[in-house]
């Protein structure tokens, strides 16, 4: 692959990564595909510092991240280990709530209005954040 040395136009550089913040909403899978076509992935939050950076840019708006449990266990889209990694769930979340009446539970994670995380129905049209790393050869993101 080709190495990226600077962020594309309209992306924000932070700590050797580039971030793109949507201003419209998509279902989680559509947002995931959008980022993949940009040779990026839905944002993977690996630290409190990155959490605060993303939170600052998205404001108090529900926003998808690259975390889901559609195949069972919670997984980050770039393969970052979930169990040992950073987490910022709201109290009593994730709860895989079935009471929404939309069928199934809640398999996709998003930032809530206060920045903490919640699991929700993946079809909800939330905003999203794409992330790509600088100085790293582009490669195909892992399949879900």
């Amino acid at each position: 692959g080709s190495e990226r040395t600077c962020c594309p136009v309209n992306w924000v550089e932070h700590e050797r990564s580039c971030y793109w913040f949507s201003r419209s909403g998509k279902a989680w899978a559509d947002a995931d595909n959008y980022c993949r076509l940009e040779d990026a992935h839905l944002v993977v939050v690996t630290s409190w510092e990155e959490q605060k950076f993303v939170q600052h840019h998205i404001g108090p708006v529900n926003t998808w991240m690259g975390l889901h449990d559609q195949n069972g266990p919670w997984k980050w889209v770039d393969g970052t280990d979930y169990e040992t990694g950073f987490k910022n769930w709201r109290p009593e979340q994730p709860d895989d709530w079935y009471g929404h009446g939309l069928g199934g539970g809640e398999d996709c994670a998003h930032f809530t209005d206060d920045g903490r995380w919640n699991d929700d129905v993946c079809q909800r049209p939330y905003r999203w954040v794409c992330e790509t790393e600088l100085d790293k050869a582009s490669q195909e993101p892992p399949l879900l």
Epitope: G1, V9, N10, K26, Y34, R36, L37, D39, Q139
Partner: antibody, heavy 120, light 107 residues
Framework: EVQLLESGGDMVQPGGSLRLSCAAS????????MSWVRQAPGKGLEWVSV????????FYADSVKGRFTISRDNSKNTLYLQMNSLRAEDTAVYYC?????????????WGQGTMVTVSS | DIQMTQSPSSLSASVGDRVTITCRAS??????LNWYQQQTGKAPKFLIY???SLQSGVPSRFSGSGSGTDFTLTISSLQPEDFATYYC?????????FGPGTKVDIK
């Protein structure tokens, strides 16, 4: 000048294979997602496939999934479409198209097209 | 998959006329809507992206509007070179899909 030039179109029998090429010039090829779009004789436009700038991600129309493969060689500034198990309904002019800025911004540059005819 | 429809499928107009073409998506696509012009035997030409943004080099008589599911392409004063087929296309999600086209011919 930004330019796309398709080649490889031909007449082929049903079940046969063909590889189309699209040579790009005048822009930083690896920075843009690229698509194939086709148009059957007398019909409208049908999107076929898209590939990201690095070639790492690609998506297909249901009508070609499992039969067609999109790829690119950024060192040669060339886009490809490998077409297998061809059917009569694949007969069309095939255009390659460049995405405007991002992969969801529409196609701002089109090639002149190459004709694929599937017939026995 | 998102289905796109256009109306009318064809229309006859005269030079100087104001022409409006509508495009509808089967679900909300925000403003991920593009318009193309295709003259007979030629490759499509990009006119408008993001529902209302005019592509560089496209005459200002072309304009687009709409959001969600309903969109419009307007040609304020039809010129001889505008007689062609016009397609809308959604780029909200793959598979990207085109409308069936609207043919604008001379009255």
């Amino acid at each position: 000048e930004v330019q796309l030039l398709e080649s490889g179109g031909d007449m082929v029998q049903p079940g046969g294979s063909l590889r189309l090429s699209c040579a790009a010039s005048g822009f930083t090829f690896s920075s843009y997602a690229m698509s194939w779009v086709r148009q059957a004789p007398g019909k409208g436009l049908e999107w076929v496939s898209v590939i990201s700038g690095s070639g790492g991600s690609s998506f297909y129309a249901d009508s070609v999934k499992g039969r067609f493969t999109i790829s690119r060689d950024n060192s040669k500034n060339t886009l490809y479409l490998q077409m297998n198990s061809l059917r009569a309904e694949d007969t069309a002019v095939y255009y390659c198209a460049k995405d405007r800025v991002r992969a969801h911004d529409g196609f701002d540059i089109w090639g002149q097209g190459t004709m694929v005819t599937v017939s026995s | 998959d998102i289905q796109m429809t256009q109306s009318p499928s064809s229309l006859s107009a005269s030079v100087g006329d104001r022409v409006t073409i509508t495009c509808r998506a089967s679900q909300s696509i925000s403003n991920y809507l593009n318009w193309y012009q295709q003259q007979t035997g030629k490759a499509p030409k990009f006119l408008i992206y993001a529902a209302s943004s005019l592509q560089s080099g496209v005459p200002s008589r072309f304009s687009g509007s709409g959001s969600g599911t309903d969109f419009t392409l307007t040609i304020s004063s039809l010129q001889p070179e505008d007689f062609a087929t016009y397609y809308c296309q959604q780029s909200y999600s793959t598979p990207f899909t085109f409308g069936p086209g609207t043919k604008v011919d001379i009255k």
